[in-house]
Each structure stands twice: as C-alpha cells, then as structure tokens.
Interface confidence: low
C-alpha cells in the first residue's frame, strides 16, 4: 500500500492592495493533483500578526482569503493542503506547510509617530480624528492621514485638516457613506526634510466610537404624592431610540445624589413631601444592541424644580 501524499499550495503570498491593513492572502493549487481529479481539495490557512499568541484558522476551497491586519506589526501566515477522507479511502491527508510573511519596513524611530490618536464619530454623523505630533519631531514635520473602508475604490487622503501653528493635528472627515459595521482603516504618515517619520496604523468600527448629542427637553411630571416622573427626548440625528442608554444624575435639596442608568427616556423617582428642590441632568450613549462600545455624550443642561406644588409644574427646557 503506497502512502498517499499531497503537496502544499504553490505561490503562497500576502498581497497589500494599499488598503492600509486589509490584505489579500492568495495561493495556487499544489503540484501533481492529477490523481485527485474527483476530489475537492481544501486548504487550511492560519495567520496572525507577529507577536499575537493565537492564530486565526480558516478552512476554504478558494485560492484566496482577505482580512484586516495591524500594519504596525508584521504578519505571518501558513497554509497546507487537505485531502478529505473521502478522497483517500481513509483518514484525511495533510501536506506540509507553506509559509510566508509580510511587513512594512519601518521608517524612522518609534518616537516620531503620532501620539494620542483619538477618533470620535459625533452623533453617528461626523468623524473627527486628532493627534499630537511625535515626541521630539521637528517643527517642519507634517502628518498626513489616509483612510479606507470596504466600498471605497482606494485609500483617500484627508481633505480637511485641523491645524495648529501650520502643522496638521487632526482631520475632519467628509460624509462617509455606508461606513459603519465594517473595519475602518487609517494610516497617519509624516514627512520631514530632516528625518524619516514612522507611520501609524489604526483600525476600528465607526459605530463603536460614537459620541451622541446630549438628550433634550427635560421635564418633570408628578405621578403621585411620592413619585415624580423625569422625562427627556432623544437628540436629533440618525441614532434610533432603541440604540440609547442613559445615565441620570439627580440631586435632591442639594444633598442626595442619585445616579441611575436606564434604557428608555423616562425615570420614576420616589420623593418625600419635604423635597424642596429637585435637579437632574442626563447623558446618552449608544447601547450594546447597536455597538460594542461607545462614548458618553456631554451632560444635558440641568433642569431644576423649586417650589411648593410640583403637580402643577411641567417644566420644558
């Protein structure tokens, strides 16, 4: 009985199409597949950023795969051919591994890359990124931001930079059509007459960096002798009501501070007849049903009630 062997895939490579971290892994079928014409050969692909403890593993019949990587680090990948047991009258047969690596050769020392990169998607409408120049870069250094997400033909450069003393320190993005719930890739590189500048790569999803506007139209309504209902409205904009969480801060008679997190636009508060003053503020955040993360809005304007008969008052901000 001759042992069945299969070769690894040929021409295994990682191709960078210029999408700032979204890479193509591609290969060709192994040599000498003639005796397995009736078989559908599969490939097991493993890949990771260098330094990562875990490999991502994919089994596919295709000759390519695409995924996002952190280009601040190198990438390593390996692939082998799998012959399913149906092809071999027995157990699955695996080839040896074909391996490849990819990295962008770093320019300049790490201290030259941008510091404290911060991106916020305001009200799920306007993306703004800001950064500080690298520690110790000269004042002639300027940074440029490029971005890409699936749907764009190629990476685009920022066209509306935020500047300080003539140096780019941020970017206001244009309207980004169909850009949420997918990886958004950014590269900030730099130029200087004197020094090579290290590039920085960032990847995030826009829905996870949303900072909503604060709630508006805060009101009080007396529900009973010992209950007051606090109400507010969601801010204008594209974020649906179902996507909000709220945090309320309530102060009674300048002493008791109540904080609570709720999922809808009302909160019922137990009070005593002695309550002379009631103030509250609310802020909003995109909830776990619509994103994995988010940023609290600013607090709303404070709404206060002072006086005798709360039942006769409905205050509108």
């Amino acid at each position: 009985d001759t042992e069945i062997k299969v070769n690894p895939p040929q021409d295994f490579e990682i191709v960078d199409p210029g999408y700032l971290g979204y890479l193509y892994l591609q290969w060709q079928p192994p040599l000498s597949l003639d005796h397995f014409k009736e078989c559908t050969v599969e490939y097991e692909l493993k890949y990771r950023n260098i330094g990562s403890e875990t490999w991502k593993t994919i089994i596919t019949k295709n000759l390519h795969y695409k995924d996002g990587f952190d280009l601040n680090k190198g990438i390593e990948a390996k692939i082998h051919t799998l012959l399913p047991w149906q092809c071999t009258n027995g157990s699955e047969v695996q080839s040896s591994w074909a391996e490849t690596t990819y990295w962008i050769s770093p320019q300049g020392i790490p201290e030259t890359k941008v510091q404290d990169m911060d991106c916020v998607y305001y009200n799920w409408q306007y993306l703004l990124c800001s950064w500080k120049p690298g520690i110790g870069v000269l004042l002639d250094t300027n940074y440029n931001l490029f971005y890409w997400y699936e749907g764009l033909d190629h990476a685009l450069q920022c066209v509306d930079y935020i500047k300080a003393d003539g140096q780019n320190i941020g970017c206001r993005f244009p309207y980004l059509e169909a850009s949420d719930y997918k990886d958004f890739y950014i590269c900030v590189n730099g130029s200087s007459e004197n020094k090579p500048i290290r590039s920085s790569y960032f990847t995030f999803q826009l829905q996870n960096i949303v900072k909503p506007l604060p709630p508006v139209y805060l009101t009080f309504t007396r529900e009973s002798s010992c209950e007051i209902k606090l109400k507010w409205s969601i801010p204008l904009g594209p974020i649906p009501a179902r996507c909000f969480d709220y945090e309320i801060e309530i102060r009674e008679d300048d002493t008791t501070l109540v904080t609570a997190t709720v999922e809808n636009e009302t909160y019922t508060l137990k009070t005593t007849n002695e309550t002379r003053q009631l103030c509250f503020v609310v802020r909003s955040k995109v909830n776990i049903y619509c994103s994995d993360d988010g940023i609290w809005s600013e607090w709303s304007d404070k709404q206060c009630w002072e006086g005798e008969d709360l039942s006769k008052k409905t205050l509108l901000r």
Partner: antibody, heavy 119, light 111 residues
C-alpha cells in the same frame, strides 16, 4: 549599547582653533541629532548647537554662530565641532550629546573633552 | 532667549527626604500639547545624565523616585525618597526654542 567617545584634552593659545571629535556607536547614527554643550570650570551648562546626522543641517546658538562649525562623517559615525578665535573664557569641558529632535531630550552624552585656552 | 530660573540654587537634605526643585521659564515652553522641558543630573567630573524629558516622561532606566511635572512656565522635579547616590547637581533645560537653554542648577548636598 550607545557610546559616544570624544577626542582627548587640548591646550590652545588665544586666537587659535580647536576641533573636537565625537565617535558614535551602538545605534543608527543618522536617526539622531548630535548636540554640543560646554561647561566652564565650576559653571553651568551652555548649549552651543546641534547637527542633524541625517541631513547635515545645523542649528547654532547665536552666541557662537561666527566661530563654531559642526560637521559629520556618516561613514565613520563621527561628529566634529570646531571653535575658532579662541579666548580664555572658552576654557571648558565640551560635551557631545545625542538627541532626537526637540522634545526627546539629550539621552546619551560623551565623556567630555577639556579645552584649555592659555597664553 | 528663554531664561530658566531654578530654585533653590542649593539645598541640604537627608537620605529618605522628599526633595522638590522648581524651574521657571521666562515664557511658555509648551507647543503641540508637549512641554519641551528636560531635567538632568550631574555628578562632579561626570557628564550630565537625562532624568526626565517632555516635562514628565522618565528617561530610560531612571529610578521611579524621580518624577517631573508642570506645564507652561512652571516645572518641578521631585525626588520622592532621597538616596545616597542622588547627591548631585540638577539642571532643567528647555528645548522649545533655539538656543536651548539651561537653568543655573540646584546642588543637593548632604545635611
């Protein structure tokens, strides 16, 4: 490890010139600036200027502008500081000090070269 | 030129003491959110040694007892618990503007 090794002590007469060398090793020479700082006996520190080892660009302290010349030789990773028209008040220890740009600090220093100007 | 005034010019302290040295600049040394202020230690007959850069970032390999703070024109170097090897002269230095300038130094002596 990073090392900056300077040339030996010099005794010069007023009006002469002195050229101090600083040989760098243990890092990528062209990624950094080299600063020159001097210290008169019992005095504080005085920055004279710097040279970019990558492009050769120099920034001099105006006080020394007409008398100081800084050069570098990338093939030997060596920086030179020449001070001309010496006077007795130039008697000092001269240090080379590596730095990356403006805010990174001068993080490695040579051992110093004593230049004595005396008639 | 930006002038740097260090105080005190000298101080006597004991091992274990907390020591604070201040440096005042004649104008702000901040730019782009970075304070261009560095601190050095120098022992007799030796080259200066970088302790703190960018006002508060520690030089590599420096003990955690050295810390820097401040922004704008007022900066502080703090030694949280003075050790025998810390008796030396300390200089502040600005690198916002050429010519870079140093403070006059603070000599820390054994009480």
């Amino acid at each position: 490890q990073v090392q900056l090794v300077q040339s030996g002590a010099e005794v010069k007469k007023p009006g002469a010139s002195v050229k101090v060398s600083c040989k760098a090793s243990g890092y990528t020479f062209t990624n950094y600036w080299m600063n020159w700082v001097r210290q008169a006996p019992g005095q504080g520190l005085e920055w004279m200027g710097r040279i970019d080892a990558y492009a050769g660009e120099t920034h001099y302290n105006q006080k020394f502008k007409d008398r100081v010349t800084m050069t570098r030789d990338t093939s030997t990773s060596t920086v030179y500081m020449e001070l001309s028209s010496l006077r007795s008040e130039d008697t000092a220890v001269y240090y080379c000090a590596r730095g990356y740009g403006d805010a990174y600090g001068m993080d490695h220093w040579g051992q110093g070269t004593l230049v004595t100007v005396s008639s | 030129d930006i002038q740097l005034t260090q105080s005190p010019s000298s101080l006597s302290a004991s091992v274990g003491d907390r020591v604070t040295i201040t440096c005042r600049a004649s104008e702000s040394v901040d730019n782009y959110g970075i304070s261009f202020m560095n601190w050095f230690q120098q022992k007799p007959g030796k080259a200066p040694k970088l302790l703190i850069y960018a006002a508060s970032r520690q030089g590599s390999g420096d003990p955690a007892r050295f810390s820097g703070s401040g922004s704008g024109t007022d900066f502080t170097l703090t030694i949280s618990s003075l050790q025998p090897e810390d008796f030396a002269t300390y200089f502040c230095q600005q690198s916002k503007e050429v010519p870079w300038t140093f403070g006059g130094g603070t000599k820390v002596e054994i009480k």
